[in-house]
Interface confidence: low
């Protein structure tokens, strides 16, 4: 008879990514005996919480907790029962809650309290619900991408750990309410708030990161809508033939639209607004989101924010991926260069509502907003972050790596569960030749 080797025991971790527009649950797993290996933690399963983000429950905090129940019940099924008590559970809220925390700290505390109450009812090892800073969101996204792509260390055939020669990958995240850019740099930080020093597997990394609040896709669309209401009787980024009634209260309730908010307005008034398919006016409207007038440092991205020159290759995920994927797949447009990306944005902005619907059947929900989204992505990358054609050639638009969603959630869990050691593992690892 032959001994059957049992598969290694698995460990699990759960992160709830409470974004501005919705919450996603990610369950990660890894072999218990290989905790310090790189790239060993992967996504086991995921679940999208129905409804809006937890920040949308400001007036009904208990509803925020209740909204998570369906996914938590799935977690009970997805994680083996005997592993429940040892499975860490985290909730991290991002820019939607950062905005709520700015405008209504009490409501933000109530929402987090309600969510905590729900999460503590489950048999997992709940380790807290909190609002991530913009820096955390950026850095943990960068950690996730480079961990999954095994850029930190490699395990050589002789059983030695070594750092691969390929550098790290920069990370660009476009969420609903904020956008983050993070990359390794050799330039000294002129603004200490934008520099993060990391020690991972015995290697030192100097990372530049910045999060732009109000520059997430949903908030950008709200700001463009507010600008269109302010300066035009139409929306140049919406397709001709598309019209809708806009509730002024919805447009102006966000702190991101405060600059365009009229002194007095009727929050319950509805204004009819139509699209005009005007790529040039749309570009002007999007340009208004970026200010290049003052820079207190030797160089800036926009709005007076310090940024060293972009360096190395980048992975652009979340709404960067969805926007570019729409242009590439749904519209069949090439986007390999900045020039092509701009041409693709102009192409979409030229389409009438009828043409768009014919081109992309069954995708009504955000169809009218892809012109603005594409124009914003193109301007953010080229004018905002300063990518030229050469640098843009090193950007990949991808939402997953190693079958795991790229975002801050995995990096956050890796950090809080100490799955990335600061120092390298022992010089040699036992090599199994069986």
């Amino acid at each position: 008879t032959r001994d059957i080797r049992e598969p290694p025991a698995l460990k699990y971790g759960i992160v709830l990514d409470a974004g501005s527009s919705h919450t996603s649950m990610f369950i990660y797993k890894w072999p218990a005996d290989k905790e310090n290996d790189t790239g060993i933690v992967g996504q086991h399963s995921s679940c999208d919480v129905p409804g809006g983000g937890i920040s949308s429950y400001a007036d009904n905090p208990s509803g925020a907790g209740q909204s998570l129940v369906g996914c938590l019940e799935q977690a009970l099924r997805d994680v083996p029962k005997e592993r429940h008590a040892g499975t860490p559970l985290y909730l991290g809220a991002t820019a939607g809650m950062r905005l709520l925390n700015l405008t209504n700290p009490e409501a933000s505390t109530s929402v987090l309290t309600a969510v905590t109450h729900t999460l503590t009812q489950y048999p997992f090892d709940f380790r807290g619900a909190r609002i991530l800073s913009g820096q955390e969101e950026g850095v943990f996204g960068w950690v996730t991408a480079n961990y999954l792509l095994e850029n930190f260390i490699k395990y050589g055939w002789v059983g030695r750990w070594f750092r691969p020669r390929k550098g790290t990958l920069g990370a660009m995240d476009l969420g609903g309410a904020s956008t983050q850019i993070t990359f390794e740099t050799t330039s000294p930080a002129e603004d200490r708030a934008s520099e993060v020093q990391l020690r991972l597997y015995g290697q030192h990394y100097r990372v530049y990161t910045h999060s732009f609040l109000c520059y997430g896709r949903d908030q950008v669309l709200q700001r463009l809508l507010a600008s269109a209401l302010q300066t035009h009787s139409f929306h140049p980024c919406w397709p001709r033939g598309f019209s809708t009634h806009v509730l002024l209260g919805d447009v102006y309730q966000s702190p991101c639209t405060v600059a365009q908010r009229p002194q007095t307005f009727n929050s319950s008034a509805r204004v009819s607004l139509s699209g005009s398919s005007d790529p040039h006016l749309c570009r002007d409207l999007v340009s208004g989101l970026f200010s290049f007038s003052s820079c207190p440092f030797s160089r800036c991205s926009f709005n007076g924010v310090f940024q060293p020159p972009v360096a190395g290759n980048f992975i652009a995920f979340s709404a960067f991926f969805y926007t570019v994927n729409f242009l590439r797949t749904s519209m069949g447009l090439p986007v390999a260069t900045l020039q092509q990306l701009e041409a693709a944005a102009v192409n979409v902005c030229n389409q009438t509502w009828a043409q768009l619907q014919a081109r992309v059947p069954g995708q009504q929900a955000h169809l009218a907003d892809y012109c603005a989204g594409a124009m914003f992505v193109q301007q953010l990358l080229s004018r905002g972050y300063g990518f030229d054609e050469r640098a843009f050639g090193g950007v990949i638009f991808q939402k997953k790596a190693a079958d795991t969603a790229v975002g801050w959630a995995l990096g956050y869990m890796l950090n809080l569960t100490n799955l990335i050691p600061a120092d390298p593992p022992g010089l040699r690892k036992g090599t199994d030749f069986s």
Partner: antibody, heavy 125, light 106 residues
Framework: QVQLVQSGAEVVKPGASVKISCKAS????????MDWVKQAPGQRLEWIGD????????TYNQQFKGKATITVDTSASTAYMELSSLRSEDTAVYYC??????????????????WGQGTLVTVSS | EIVLTQSPATLSASPGERITLSCSAS?????IHWYQQKPGQAPRLLIY???NLASGIPARFSGSGSGTFYTLTISSVEPEDAAVYYC?????????FGGGTKLEIK
């Protein structure tokens, strides 16, 4: 260098109000939150609340809600704290403190890196 | 709120002596800071984030700990170290301070 200079000592009657100031210099005022801390005789330090000068948003320790009101004048790089309905137990030294931060793994770890010299408020009839 | 209990309340030490001050939290905190306050002065940041020495603080000061128990160690006490030492948590709202440990030099 970074400095916080507070207004002078105050003697006030019970039931009255007092407004103390904290003038910042040596750094960009809107880049850091300003916090206020109470030190009553023989008591531990107590955090009162803070203000984010960039967004003019203040947060308070529940125990000081209704007692303290924190404001800023960004053009003068000055933070203020008004204490109302004063009683003898409000007698204390009040400090303003700049909220510094330390970034590690992208996490902001906050602490009070620069303090004002303190303002003694004595409530006495 | 999280209550921080410092011990001992008062400590008397001779120059050159190694001493340890402790800070115990009523529930787990991620990190704590230590401040030094000399008579008639404002508190001064000594150690931030459990173990990081603040700018201008001599290397004889060190901090450690995790969870609910943290310590501040002075490896070789100097006369100018006479002060009250406070621990402070910023993990859970509202931010709280310990009651302080008064260090007297013999």
């Amino acid at each position: 260098q970074v400095q916080l200079v507070q207004s002078g000592a105050e003697v006030v009657k019970p039931g009255a109000s007092v407004k103390i100031s904290c003038k910042a210099s040596g750094y960009t005022f809107t880049d850091y939150n300003m916090d206020w801390v109470k030190q009553a005789p023989g008591q531990r330090l107590e955090w009162i609340g803070d203000i984010n000068p960039k967004y003019d948003i203040s947060t308070y320790n529940q125990q000081f809600k209704g007692k303290a009101t924190i404001t800023v004048d960004t053009s003068a790089s000055t933070a203020y704290m008004e204490l109302s309905s004063l009683r003898s137990e409000d007698t204390a030294v009040y400090y303003c403190a700049r909220r510094g931060f330390f970034l590690y793994y992208g996490i902001n770890y906050y602490y009070f890196d620069v303090w004002g010299q303190g303002t003694l408020v004595t409530v006495s009839s | 709120e999280i209550v921080l209990t410092q011990s001992p309340a008062t400590l008397s030490a001779s120059p050159g002596e190694r001493i340890t001050l402790s800070c115990s939290a009523s529930s787990s905190v991620s990190y704590i800071h230590w401040y030094q306050q000399k008579p008639g002065q404002a508190p001064r940041l000594l150690i931030y984030s459990t173990s990081n020495l603040a700018s201008g603080i001599p290397a004889r000061f060190s901090g450690s700990g995790s969870g609910t128990f943290y310590t501040l160690t002075i490896s070789s006490v100097e006369p100018e170290d006479a002060a009250v030492y406070y621990c402070h948590q910023w993990s859970s709202y509202p931010w709280t301070f310990g009651g302080g440990t008064k260090l007297e030099i013999k």
